[in-house]
């Protein structure tokens, strides 16, 4: 299973669910829906409110039983790390792939954890990351901005991840904008 | 008491296919993801294949990957495995089993496939 | 072919005990309480003998037990008799392979 890691902006819009939790058990396999259930203690949800209603404490995230599939495998086995968790909802369940945003958070940026607490939210409704995966591209839309951090190293290690974004400068026309200048 | 039939083995061409049934009975069916396991003659047991209670997920060896598909069809308490661009080494006694990659609880008697020109 | 380590055989004489191994790494036995050890008699199907490593189903004798320790689990037969003759296979799930089994242990009932 490979995929290429979002910009994390499009992880937050495109989940259903952006938490902050320990994982804190040993996975567990259903042996009727074949899927692997991590135990987390949540800490922080950041999206998510309303698609949960009242039942607004996870307690497991699912994935495939096998990585072929894109099952996501926890390789951490400190219960103390907090992780930044970015799925998808199916059956009221938090179901999370080898392709989910998930990442401690003390390895994101000052700029991206402000992103994930107040910022992306911002851009998710008008604005678009547009990976630019080979030179030349070009911007289909005002909307759209252009993702270069793949075609000078690690997407996820690059500039644009780690410290902009693509929010709403006029109605029509989104622009990187440094996560830094917003307000804490 | 639960019972599983596998059936459709047989004779068959390299490059060839087979559909392969398991009928179960004895139990609810669709509460238990269920597996195809097989032997080649004189050799060791091979997992290849599971499939979740509902049908929505599926898993392969690497070995059958591309070539092999499980279904199962919760009305008919079945369970199948179609098998395209058979080879030589898939010749075995295949068997289905209750459940996924582990805890095997009830087997088929097996049904042979010989691969072969 | 990804299999989990058996000793091809072993023996062992009427009322006496023996131990079956089975290795693995970390990715399988080490890292899942999901081992399963099954028996199969010459030409019938394989039998559930202990699941969830130390689990025994209904109906299976408490003279067959399971442990675990790291990356080896071990199958135990107590008070050997002639019907414990046959193949005896050990099973892991992995997250890499999805299941994997030993390569099977004759175990030979003397005299």
């Known amino acids: 299973c490979t995929c290429v890691p979002p910009h994390p902006q499009t992880a937050f819009c495109n989940s259903d669910l952006v938490i902050r939790a320990k994982f804190v058990g040993t996975p567990e396999v259903n042996q009727t829906t074949l899927y692997q259930r991590y135990e987390i203690k949540m800490t922080k949800m950041y999206k998510g409110f309303q698609a949960l209603g009242d039942a607004a404490d996870i307690r497991f995230v699912y994935t495939p039983a096998m990585e072929s599939v894109c099952g996501y495998f926890h390789r951490s086995h400190n219960r103390s790390e907090e992780f930044l968790i970015a799925g998808k909802l199916q059956d009221g369940l938090l179901h999370i792939t080898t392709c989910s945003f998930v990442a401690p958070w003390n390895s994101l940026s000052l700029a991206q954890r402000r992103g994930f607490t107040k910022t992306y939210t911002v851009g998710c409704e008008e604005c678009t990351v547009f990976p630019c995966l080979s030179i030349p591209c070009k911007l289909q839309s005002g909307t759209h901005c252009l993702w270069t951090d793949q075609l000078l190293q690690g997407s996820e290690k690059g500039f644009q991840s780690r410290h902009l974004a693509c929010l709403p400068r006029e109605p029509g026309l989104c622009t990187w904008q440094s996560l830094r200048s917003q307000i804490a | 008491q639960v019972q599983l039939v596998e059936s459709g083995g047989g004779l068959v061409q390299p490059g060839g296919s087979l559909r392969l049934s398991c009928a179960a009975s004895g139990f609810t069916f669709s509460s238990y993801a269920m597996s195809w396991v097989r032997q080649a003659p004189g050799k060791g047991l091979e997992w290849v294949s599971a499939?979740?209670?509902?049908?929505?997920?599926?898993y392969y060896a690497d070995s059958v990957k591309g070539r092999f598909t499980i279904s199962r069809d919760n009305s008919k308490n079945t369970l199948y495995l179609q098998m395209n661009s058979l080879r030589a080494e898939d010749t075995a006694v295949y068997y289905c089993a209750r459940g996924g990659f582990f805890n095997m609880d009830y087997w088929g008697q097996g049904t042979l496939v010989t691969v072969s020109s | 072919d990804i299999a989990l380590t058996q000793p091809a055989s072993v023996s062992g004489s009427p009322g006496q005990s023996i131990t079956i191994s089975c290795t693995g790494t970390?990715?399988?036995?080490?890292?899942?309480?999901?081992v399963s050890w099954y028996q199969q008699h010459p030409g019938k199907a394989p039998k559930l003998m202990i699941y969830d490593v130390s689990n025994r189903p209904s109906g299976v004798s408490n003279r067959f037990s399971g442990s675990k320790s790291g990356n080896t689990a071990s199958l135990t037969i107590s008070g050997l008799q002639a019907e414990d003759e046959a193949d005896y296979y050990c099973?892991?799930?992995?997250?890499?392979?999805?299941?994997?089994f030993g390569g099977g242990t004759k175990l030979t009932v003397l005299g």
């Open positions: 970390s990715s399988d036995v080490g890292g899942y309480n999901y």
């Open positions: 499939i979740s209670g509902s049908g929505g997920s599926t």
């Open positions: 099973q892991s799930y992995d997250f890499t392979y999805g299941s994997v």
